[in-house]
Amino acid sequence: VAKKKDKVKKGGPGSECAEWAWGPCTPSSKDCGVGFREGTCGAQTQRIRCRVPCNWKKEFGADCKYKFENWGACDGGTGTKVRQGTLKKARYNAQCQETIRVTKPCTPKTKAKAKAKKGKGKD
């Protein structure tokens, strides 16, 4: 237990300081990879290592939170359904799309229903 305590840096996230405000993770080079995040609490400051994934799609990552509508009906022609998301919250430096459209394949059940509906329309 003592060892664990020693590992907590004085003034760090585990100390008595109540409210730490953490800045964004800034990669040391280029746009992604290992970097640092700076935190402040009163007169104390601390830098912690962090990582920005290199394979993310920024506008769909955790940097951008969206409020989504319900899924639309299955499109029998494409076998997919769509829903739209409106930006709810973005990390301060994240350049998020205001609205996004997400597509996914219909489940076999929904596909069958869509096909049946299409067939009825043709009769």
Partner: antibody, heavy 117, light 107 residues
Framework: QVQLVQSGAEVKKPGASVKVSCKAS????????MNWVRQAPGQGLEWIGM????????ILNQKFKDKATLTVDISTSTAYMELSSLRSEDTAVYYC??????????WGQGTLVTVSS | EIVLTQSPATLSLSPGERANLSCRAS??????LHWYQQKPHQAPRLLIK???QSISGIPARFSGSGPGTDFNLTISSVEPEDFAVYYC?????????FGGGTKLEIK
Amino acid sequence: QVQLVQSGAEVKKPGASVKVSCKASGQSFSSYWMNWVRQAPGQGLEWIGMIHPSDSETILNQKFKDKATLTVDISTSTAYMELSSLRSEDTAVYYCSSWSAKRGDFWGQGTLVTVSS
Amino acid sequence: EIVLTQSPATLSLSPGERANLSCRASESISNNLHWYQQKPHQAPRLLIKYASQSISGIPARFSGSGPGTDFNLTISSVEPEDFAVYYCQQSNSWPLTFGGGTKLEIK
């Protein structure tokens, strides 16, 4: 476009409090960080803090932690900043600005708060 | 906190000349640096975001460079309406901070 309209100028006595409002119209108020910045007469710009209307997450400049309180009312698309224990050094123009990393920002016209006995 | 140092404090130029304004950060801030113009009795206006990204409605004569610790705002050919105070601001870590400003005045 987002339009931000701030409340009018205020004259307050030392020790008093003041609440400045910033009403947004146009694009979605709740999606963007609202910053508050002050500018003392003849001086530069100083960041007070910011609040996100979607969940009221607030990040304050530690210098203003005992001075400023930031709130929002989503139903009226209005952000508020209350300043307490006013002193003559708090005399300044206070600005709100709505920030989007993608499109940039929009600023209110500023509210002059004068603290004088 | 990150300190931004702007130079020169005052820049005297004639219309048509090229303006180079500098902003130096006390540590690396990636490209999280923005430039504002402020005229008397007006709110600041964003000119450039993220070191070099242009803003809709801002004339093409304004351009920015970075990233890292040394940033520049360039006005390729100064127009009479460009005489104002220019501030840089960083959004790399809290608190957000502004530089002290550069006043661009008519020579």
